[in-house]
């Protein structure tokens, strides 16, 4: 009877279960009754990072210097290529795509430390009573608008993202 | 295209002054927070003033602050950096940089060396 499922490291096809090819090398064609898979090592910059049945490698990745990468660690037949920035910038995510001097905070928050050649900005989230509507790099959370002080009330509560509106007071007949 | 292009930058003497010019196109720059940054020889990338979209807040390096000024004129899409008391560790590559400050958005520079 043919199998329905296979061991780890195998794939079923055609009612038989074939060896997935090691990291590092392509599927050719799949394993017959009498053969079996054949796989070849990926070509120069290019990968396969797991057991698989792929018919092609992945190319590896471009550290691309126009947008401040460079090389932090070269690819293999099995592993990308790792990308970073050049010395004072930073990664804008985890995969490192593409290189900033220093992040910005985004609105709700504010910066706490500006940054340096060595470190990044540090943002901070406001907290209640202040606020930021801006994304900046050197710009704190502001304290919200104290309405009394003008001799307004407060018309319309405010956020981490937004000043409080102040209004005139209602006036008793 | 993001073009930011500096001038203004030449042989200054010590204690004199100087007022780069940076002209930006190619984005809607009374958005956009804008930054000096500079490279003095050899050495990394100081940040030295930044100043909001309006021009109502502005940030300052303490190693410049009361000396330099930033300002904007939206108008003209042109933002300004007016340094007096000028002293040898000024000499470096002025750049202006916008948000988000990003690797390609950047000018060629403008080189103030300042020497007797």
């Known amino acids: 009877e043919p199998p329905t499922a296979c061991r780890e490291k195998q794939y079923l096809i055609n009612s038989q279960c074939c060896s997935l090819c090691q990291p590092g090398q392509k599927l050719v064609s799949d394993c017959t009754e009498f053969t079996e898979t054949e796989c070849l090592p990926c070509g120069e910059s290019e990968f396969l990072d797991t057991w698989n049945r792929e018919t092609h490698c992945h190319q590896h990745k471009y550290c691309d210097p126009n947008l401040g990468l460079r090389v932090q660690q070269k690819g293999t037949s099995e592993t990308d290529t790792i990308c970073t920035c050049e010395e004072g910038w930073h990664c804008t995510s985890e995969a490192c795509e593409s290189c900033v001097l220093h992040r910005s905070c985004s609105p709700g928050f504010g910066v706490k430390q500006i940054a340096t050649g060595v470190s990044d900005t540090i943002c901070e989230p406001c907290p209640v009573g202040f606020f930021s509507n801006v994304s900046s790099a050197f710009e704190k959370c502001h304290p919200w608008t104290s309405c009394e002080t003008k001799d307004l009330v407060v018309q319309q509560a405010g956020t981490n993202k937004t000043d409080v509106v102040c209004g005139p007071q209602d006036r008793l007949r | 295209e993001v073009q930011l292009l500096e001038s203004g930058g030449g042989l200054v003497q010590p204690g004199g002054s100087r007022r780069l010019s940076c002209a930006a196109s190619?984005?809607?720059?009374?958005?956009?927070e804008m930054w000096w940054v500079r490279q003095a020889p050899g050495k990394g990338l100081e940040r030295v003033s930044?100043?909001?979209?309006?021009?109502?807040?502005?940030y300052y390096a303490d190693s410049v602050k009361g000396r330099f000024t930033i300002s904007r004129d939206n108008s003209k899409n042109t933002l300004y950096l007016q340094m007096n008391s000028l002293r040898a560790e000024d000499t470096a590559v002025y750049y202006c940089?916008?948000?988000?400050?990003?690797?390609?958005?950047w000018g060629q520079g403008t080189l103030v060396t300042v020497s007797s």
């Open positions: 190619g984005f809607t720059f009374r958005d956009y």
């Open positions: 940089a916008k948000l988000p400050f990003t690797f390609e958005d």
């Open positions: 930044a100043i909001n979209p309006q021009g109502t807040r502005t």
